[in-house]
């Protein structure tokens, strides 16, 4: 297994991967295979109402330099905690002996996995774009039970969500073949997105590729500067009972996902008021409704908050609320 994989993101579209060769390889290492796949954001992030008091915004940081497999907890943790940094204690003689035993066991176990669990892959002509080969098949563990599949229908809405679920690992994962080096720059990635990277050492190219068990590392690309900005107009509709429906478009490709919007509005001469619009509420109203507004001139600004932080405030939108007598409304409460 390749040792100590380290993943670093140096831009919003790249991850640098470095590793060390296996300590005790089976024969000569001819090349390495690196696969990567986009990770879905935790489903909880889509469900929670981050406007509720006491609910901290989730913290997601991109992968800083020298992040190893053992230090992945940083960008996988749900909420950020600032713990003091520690350094490891010197190893005892018994620990060193234990590690040597583990190294020997790992080599024996890898041989076992090669021969018993995995069927070797056929030769590939990898281009780096996608994996045209069949994935390494596990030996059959029995048939899967019957699955009822409903008849597909034409969906009414175009599938344009920026937060769609990434494709399954079996659907042509991108990969790169690395020869004569222990590093790779993975490019063309989505901004502020978590990736699971799989690294294998191979000791034969043809006729059958023989590769090690994978080492895994996770990394997140850096945020894109303006990705969380609301583009397009903030529109408004004034209903008869001084209800103003503000509407805006979700940023097309946000950093991770938008968890809430801040609405800042004020009547001319009054102090600014703030309103938090959760993802859930925005999904229902495509904006928010301001109710019980006193007559006068108003300005409103909106900004989105994503997993990476705040976007920019929109340019102010202005509207005028007339002096409206309390007529029963035909709009829901």
């Amino acid at each position: 297994v390749p040792l100590d994989p380290i993943s670093v993101s140096n831009s919003s579209s790249q991850i640098i991967l470095k590793w060390k060769p296996p300590s005790d390889p089976n024969g000569n290492i001819t090349h390495y295979l690196v696969f990567w796949e986009r990770q879905a954001e935790d489903s909880e992030l889509f469900e929670l109402d981050y406007c509720l008091k006491g609910l901290k915004l989730p913290s997601r940081t991109w992968s800083p330099p020298f992040e190893s497999e053992d230090s992945q907890k940083h960008n996988q943790s749900e909420y950020e905690d600032s713990a003091g940094e520690c350094c490891s204690c010197p190893k005892t003689d018994s620990q060193i002996l234990k590690e040597l035993e583990e190294s020997s066991f790992r080599k024996t176990f890898e041989d076992y996995l090669h021969n018993v669990v995995f069927v070797p892959r056929k030769t590939s002509s990898g281009t780096g774009a996608e994996d045209p080969r069949p994935s390494r098949k596990r030996r059959s563990l029995g048939d899967v039970g019957n699955v009822t599949v409903a008849v597909p229908t034409v969906a009414a809405f175009p599938n344009t969500s920026s937060t769609s679920v990434p494709t399954s690992p079996e659907e042509h994962r991108p990969f790169e073949k690395v020869v004569n080096k222990e590093s790779l720059v993975i490019s063309g990635l989505r901004h502020f997105t978590g990736y699971r990277i799989e690294l294998q050492a191979c000791n034969q190219d043809t006729p059958e590729e023989r590769c090690s068990v994978a080492a895994y590392v996770s990394a997140r690309t850096m945020p894109e500067a303006k990705a969380d900005d609301i583009v397009g107009p903030v529109t408004h509709e004034i209903f008869e009972n001084n209800v103003v429906h503000l509407m805006w478009q979700e940023p097309k490709e946000p950093n991770g996902l938008i968890v809430l919007y801040e609405v800042s509005y004020r009547r001319y001469g009054d102090e600014e008021l703030h309103l938090c619009v959760s993802r859930k509420h925005f999904a229902l109203e495509r904006g928010c409704r301001l109710r019980g507004l006193s007559p006068g001139n108003y300005s409103v600004r909106i900004r989105a908050t994503s997993l990476a932080g705040n976007g920019s405030w929109t340019e102010p939108t202005y509207f005028y609320v007339t002096d409206y007598l309390d007529v029963p409304s035909n709009i829901a409460k």
Epitope: S43, F46, E47, L48, D49, T153, A155, A156, F157, P158, N159, T160, S161, S162, T163, S164, V165, E237, F239, E240, V243, H245, Q249, E250, R279, K280, F282, A283, L284, E285, R286, R289, N330, I331, A332, K333
Partner: antibody, heavy 122, light 110 residues
Amino acid sequence: QMQLVQSGAEVKKTGESLKISCQGYGYRFTDNWIGWVRQMPGRGLEWMGIIYPGDSETRYSPSFQGQVTISADKSISTAYLEWSSLKASDTAMYYCARHAPLAVAGMALGDWGQGTLVTVSS
Amino acid sequence: QTVVTQEPSFSVSPGGTVTLTCGLSSGSVSTGYSPGWYQQTPGQAPRTLVYNTNTRSSGVPDRFSGSILGNKAALTITGAQADDESDYYCALYMGSGTYVFGGGTKLTVL
């Protein structure tokens, strides 16, 4: 492919309880509001209420508040419509429908289940 | 109680044009109500034709178009075909997760 699949037809007696279901496929179920619509025999469509499966927040039409319970189990991407004591007047076709997803401008009911026919006899 | 009004029935000749409307018992319909139009043939689930006033759903022919005409929402069908014979419902979004449907229009293609 996005779709909503509803449970099969039900024949019940007055006073009995019933829970019908609507399962979502092909999209992020927890992130989309799901509504329920009633259609009595030979009549038009009536809005009943809506649920956000992510945290089960519900909003009911005043006509149906207290008459039915809307719930969801996000772990199996399923929304439910429930009666504790059926009446003959509950005989109808019930549809679930997905409220427009976030990427769509405006509010609308977009994708519909095939409907569940509930027949209540006395 | 808000009432959404539609013509109970309408006839159109094949190839002709028909405009169905959707109004409010009090006040006027605007884009803020996000008017939607739904087609239902007997024994079938409703199908979304138009949403957000004038956006056609995926797979809906461009013979169907939505708009605001005066103080009402409107669905116009140009070049009517025999299989357009259906019930058509409009729905207005009233806020806070509430929709109100119109009573429906039965369209006959003669």
